[in-house]
């Protein structure tokens, strides 16, 4: 019993004065405890406690169940134990099968004895199969078996608590061990889709699946910049051992446009924690923006290839697509096709192929989109370059030489003299009058332009070239002069062409 | 054949009460500390109580703590959860399992757990 200098508390003292008591299952249980300032017995088995007011704890029958740590404590909260057994041959242990341990800790299988002096109290495994190599345990006869730093690997190990007892092992009920794994990576948290885009009163709904060893990892759906508890629902499965997957599901029934933003989904486990983003844009209705790949204003030269292409945005998807020349709708020179396969695309692209154009074929080519909220349209202007074509080159009654031209852009007329028969004409002569013509072809066609010299001022035999040429190329006339005496004879026109 | 089986569950307005039963048999009864669980639609696996061996020893969710009382009787093999005070939050199926781990996690689950009684609080 303790000894405490006088005048200070002291604990209280037990009876019998032993720190172990072994009885006999049968026998009587006699406790005593003396203290002036007696409060309450204590005993404790396996998590349990029960309590007696009395001093005197009694147990007329012991049975093996009674085995535990009997505490008496005073006013004062000091406290004196003792500890018995309830030696039961047919029961050797008190169990409690719960056994759960978390990778790395220690835990603790409860199959406290009823004998303490039976021998080779250890672990065994079920059926004969032997324990993890690594496993190491601490023996206690009041509390149990400690296994020592739980490994993963011992998830749903089957023991047994084990004695000798005259010479025979005898084993506990059977223990499964549920290893509660400890986190060593953050989680993997993904989302089902990147960005959303919405009309108003569409639901949004999105799912962000978390993986990680267990089903302790904390996850939640925030709105980023709010504080506002968003409504989320779970699903989760365990996918065999330490393999947990939760799928968290966060909806709005009807979107409006102030609940466009970032929705984070955030998970965190003891190691760390991770997250993954989600944009919401809502509109009240849908739009259509058209983006031209290239100049609206297109030039191209005669009989060359030339494509249009357009890419454009359209939510919701497009419905109706449609290239239009001259009132007329292309059946096929064109194709429309998605800018991506991702599942949120809105970008498009249009192409119309047109080959070999001719002359006749500028003018305004539209692009037509339609979805079921709004229309949109863009026109290209194309331009198709031709050399010049010599349409008219005649002597007028007044005696004027006159060249009328055709081509795009605007030809050019150029008047020269050959005299002779020299093949080279390289006196220029100035035209007296220079006229662009109206065109009576579409507006995008040839621009005609005519031409005129006097042909008085030839005194000579000889050639007048009429030269017309623009970018692409020239073509050119010729007036033929013959004098007899004073007299002009007949002029002969005709033309080469230039290459 | 280990078999838990709950009764008790039902239809219950907000503020009433009603005392769940888990009969145990197939397995030594008092060699397990045992446990409530239950889950709400749509909801993980929760917590609920937990008693000891011989029922010295009693643990709750804060979520029920002094509204629901554990208990057992060992000799009836027997399980039972007086629920008070119910909330519509409280609806969910309810489970009788083998073990209880302190951390509340039941990673790995349980040696043995019931199919569960229906309790569904609603005015």
């Known amino acids: 019993q303790p000894s405490v200098s006088p005048g200070e508390p002291s604990p209280p003292s037990i009876h019998p004065g032993k720190s172990d008591l072994i009885v006999r299952v049968g026998d009587e249980i006699r406790l005593l405890c003396t203290d002036p300032g007696f409060v309450k017995w204590t005993f404790e088995i396996l998590d349990e406690t029960n309590e007696n007011k009395q001093n005197e704890w009694i147990t007329e029958k012991a049975e093996a169940t009674n085995t535990g740590k009997y505490t008496c404590t005073n006013k004062h909260g000091l406290s004196n134990s003792i500890y018995v057994f309830v030696r039961d041959p047919a029961k050797l242990f008190l169990v409690d099968r719960s056994l759960y341990g978390k990778e790395d800790n220690d835990t603790l299988v409860r199959c406290p004895l009823t004998d303490p002096e039976v021998t080779n109290y250890s672990l065994k495994g079920c059926q004969g199969k032997p324990l993890p190599k690594d496993l190491r345990f601490i023996p206690d006869p009041k509390a149990g078996i400690m296994i020592k730093s739980v490994k993963r690997a011992y998830h749903r190990l089957c023991l047994h608590c084990s004695v000798d007892q005259e010479g025979k092992s005898v084993l506990s009920e059977k223990f499964i061990l549920k290893v509660r794994p400890a986190f060593k990576a953050v989680p993997v948290v993904s989302v089902s889709k990147a960005s959303y885009l919405l009309r108003e009163g569409e639901e949004f709904t999105v799912t962000c699946t978390i993986k990680d060893v267990s089903s302790s990892v904390y996850s939640t759906w925030k709105r980023e910049n709010s504080q506002t508890k968003l409504q989320e629902k779970y699903n989760s499965w365990h996918h065999g051992d330490f393999n947990y997957e939760r799928q968290a599901t966060l909806t709005i029934s009807s979107a409006r446009v102030n609940d466009s933003g970032v929705f984070m989904c955030y998970a965190n486990n003891t190691f760390g924690s991770a997250n993954v983003t989600t944009t919401l844009e809502v509109v009240d209705k849908g739009f259509i923006n058209i983006f031209p790949m290239i100049n609206t204003t297109v030039f191209v030269n005669d009989g060359e290839n030339v494509d249009l292409i357009v890419e454009y945005e359209a939510f919701p998807k497009p419905e109706h697509q449609q290239w239009i020349y001259m009132n007329r709708t292309f059946t096929d020179k064109w194709e429309d096709y998605p800018k991506s396969e991702n599942e949120s695309n809105i970008r498009y692209v249009s192409e119309l192929h047109l080959t070999r154009l001719k002359g006749t074929e500028g003018g305004t080519y539209t692009f037509l989109v339609s979805n079921s909220d709004v229309n949109a349209a863009i026109a290209f202007n194309v331009y198709v370059n031709t050399k010049p074509e010599i349409l008219t080159y005649d002597r007028l009654v007044n005696g004027m030489l006159q060249c009328v031209a055709a081509g795009f852009p605007e030809p050019t007329i150029d008047w020269y003299f050959c005299p002779g028969t020299e093949q080279r004409c390289s006196a220029s002569v100035l035209p007296v009058d220079v006229q662009t013509l109206n065109s009576s072809g579409p507006p995008f066609g040839k621009l005609v332009v005519q031409s005129s010299i006097d042909s008085s001022a030839f005194k000579h035999n000889g050639t007048v070239e009429c030269k017309a040429y623009n970018d692409v190329g020239k073509t050119s006339a010729y007036f033929n002069f013959a004098f007899k005496g004073n007299n002009k004879e007949q002029i002969h026109p005709h033309t080469l062409f230039t290459p | 054949e280990v078999q838990l089986l709950e009764s008790g569950g039902g239809l219950v307005q907000p503020g009433g009460s009603l005392r769940l039963s888990c009969a145990a048999s197939?397995?030594?009864?008092?060699?397990?500390?045992m446990s409530w669980v239950r889950q709400a639609p749509g909801k993980g696996l929760e917590w609920v109580s937990a008693?000891?061996?011989?029922?010295?020893?009693?643990y709750y969710a804060d979520s029920v703590k002094g509204r629901f009382t554990i208990s057992r009787d060992n000799s009836k093999n027997t399980l039972y959860l007086q629920m008070n005070s119910l909330r519509a939050e409280d609806t969910a199926v309810y489970s009788c399992?083998?073990?209880?781990?302190?951390?509340?996690?039941?990673?790995?689950?349980?040696?043995?757990r019931g199919q569960g009684t229906l309790v569904t609080v609603s005015s």
């Open positions: 197939g397995f030594t009864f008092d060699s397990y500390a």
């Open positions: 399992a083998t073990g209880y781990d302190p951390s509340g996690h039941y990673y790995g689950g349980f040696d043995y």
């Open positions: 008693i000891s061996v011989r029922g010295g020893s009693t």
